[in-house]
């Protein structure tokens, strides 16, 4: 799309569940009619046309798909369609992974869940919500990132070695906050700044490790839009 013609962006982590939110403002008089509501979710992939599932041709339409700013887009297709009676249809390979919460739908929440989200799911999504006497829509762009934690130096460590853990997610903006923790038997224990732990943005520096430091270390990256990702790394320190 051209700059200045963007839909809201939703970030998700590859391999993790992703929620594509759609809770349009529904007039009070229509709330009682939500059981008859129908919703169709459409996906326009970022690149590489989706393979049409047999018996599920791509949605009809002109497919002009020639944006003002770049070449032809992959054809859009129906991810999931839920009719007034709860009758569902959609693209077969996606079916087991895509979900609409039935109770949510009756409250006016038509969010689509991808369990899990995959790289090919990136792109523009549109939901058309059909109520008894009006039609509403939701639009968003799903971007997928990869989360990783790296150790420098990598591999097993010896007592008194130093290590830097770097927590990252492939997203252009910086996280608003980074929280480090250790997984103990009783749950998560926050890692605080100390002579043994030096925190700097998404880095954690351990100047002198000991066998006590062996085990899972984690970080939580939180972004301004509320998206957060939790990443784990198993540290091995040899006695």
């Amino acid at each position: 799309l051209q700059p200045g013609a963007e839909v809201p962006v939703v970030w998700a982590q590859e391999g993790a569940p992703a929620q594509l939110p759609c809770s349009p403002t529904i007039p009070l008089q229509d709330l009682s009619l939500l059981r008859r509501a129908g919703v169709t979710w459409q996906h326009q992939p970022d690149s590489g046309p989706p393979a049409a599932a047999p018996g599920h041709p791509l949605a009809p339409g002109p497919h002009p798909a020639a944006p003002s700013s770049w070449g032809p887009r992959p054809r859009r297709y129906t991810v999931l369609s839920v009719g007034p009676g709860g009758l569902r249809s959609g693209r077969l390979p996606l079916q087991p992974r895509v979900q609409l919460d039935e109770r949510g739908r009756q409250r006016g929440d038509f969010s689509l869940w991808l369990r899990p989200a995959r790289r090919a799911d990136a792109g523009e999504y549109r939901a058309a919500v059909h109520l008894r006497d009006r039609a509403l829509s939701c639009r968003l762009r799903l971007r997928l990132g990869q989360a990783s934690m790296t150790a420098s130096p990598p591999g097993s460590l010896r007592a008194s070695d130093w290590v830097i853990l770097n927590c990252s997610f492939s997203r252009p903006d910086r996280p608003a906050s980074v929280h480090w923790f250790r997984n103990r038997g009783q749950g998560r224990v926050p890692v605080r700044e100390s002579p043994h732990h030096h925190l700097a943005e998404s880095f954690l520096f351990l100047p002198q490790v000991s066998p006590m430091d062996s085990g899972p270390w984690g970080c939580i990256l939180t972004y301004r839009d509320g998206f957060n990702v939790s990443i784990m790394y198993n540290l091995t320190v040899l006695g």
């Epitope: 809201p8 459409q42 002009p64 700013s69 059909h130 509403l136 829509s137 639009r139």
Partner: antibody
């Protein structure tokens, strides 16, 4: 080629009725949502009525609700607009339009229009 | 209902000029705006949909941009056949509404 041809327009007295027809050709009519859009002389375009491809959902503009009825006959590749209790303000050119998708509500194909004049 | 307010209502221009028309929605419609061209005595023709996507066969001199409530339609170099009236339409939610139109006239 893709074509929509309206018929049934004409002069009618206030309170009278008229039925517009739209014959579709050059595309799979049953796969598309359809709509009627009108334009009073010298005025902006005004959406009037809409029907989904399967006919599950039908919507009307408040100005025509209860007086106009949209219907489709997929076997005949035809769209209809039954207009009852016509008023002077219903005077307009009525366009049969194809909706790009059931879920994307812009109008990608238009007929040439049928003129409806409501006058005593 | 979502109101669409177009400006200016008319614009006088010459062949080769760049022309910009704006459309303001009364509430957020994300990128659900289409632009149409209508010549006297003819039906409208779809030019742009979803704010910035050119419809099949539409020349590249026509472009659109915007999101939320503010949208722009541009003809980069006006041609003789472009003198017509242009309408914006929101295709976000029913009732689907149009702007009042902008008449492009020869200077």
């Amino acid at each position: 080629q893709v074509q929509l041809v309206e018929s049934g327009g004409g002069l009618v007295k206030p309170g009278g009725s008229l039925r517009l027809s739209c014959a579709a050709s050059g595309f799979t009519f049953s796969s598309y949502a359809m709509s009627w859009v009108r334009q009073a002389p010298g005025k902006r375009l005004e959406w009037v009525a809409y029907v989904t491809s399967g006919g599950d959902y039908i919507y009307y503009a408040d100005t025509v609700k209860g007086r106009f009825t949209i219907s489709r006959d997929d076997a005949k590749n035809s769209l209809y607009l039954q207009m009852n209790s016509l008023r002077a303000e219903d005077t307009a050119m009525y366009y049969c339009t194809r909706v790009a998708y059931d879920y994307e509500w812009y109008f990608d194909v238009w007929g040439q229009g049928a003129l409806v004049t409501v006058s005593s | 209902d979502i109101q669409m307010t177009q400006s200016p209502s008319s614009v006088s221009t010459s062949v080769g000029d760049r022309v910009t028309i704006t459309c303001k929605a009364s509430q957020d419609v994300t990128t659900a705006v289409a632009w149409y061209q209508q010549k006297p005595g003819k039906a409208p023709k779809l030019l742009i949909y979803s704010a910035s996507y050119r419809y099949t066969g539409v020349p590249s001199r026509f472009s659109g941009s915007g999101s939320g409530t503010d949208f722009t339609f541009t003809i980069s170099s006006v041609q003789p056949e472009d003198f017509a009236t242009y309408y914006c339409q929101q295709h976000d939610s029913s009732p689907w509404t149009f702007g009042q139109g902008t008449k492009l006239e020869i200077k």
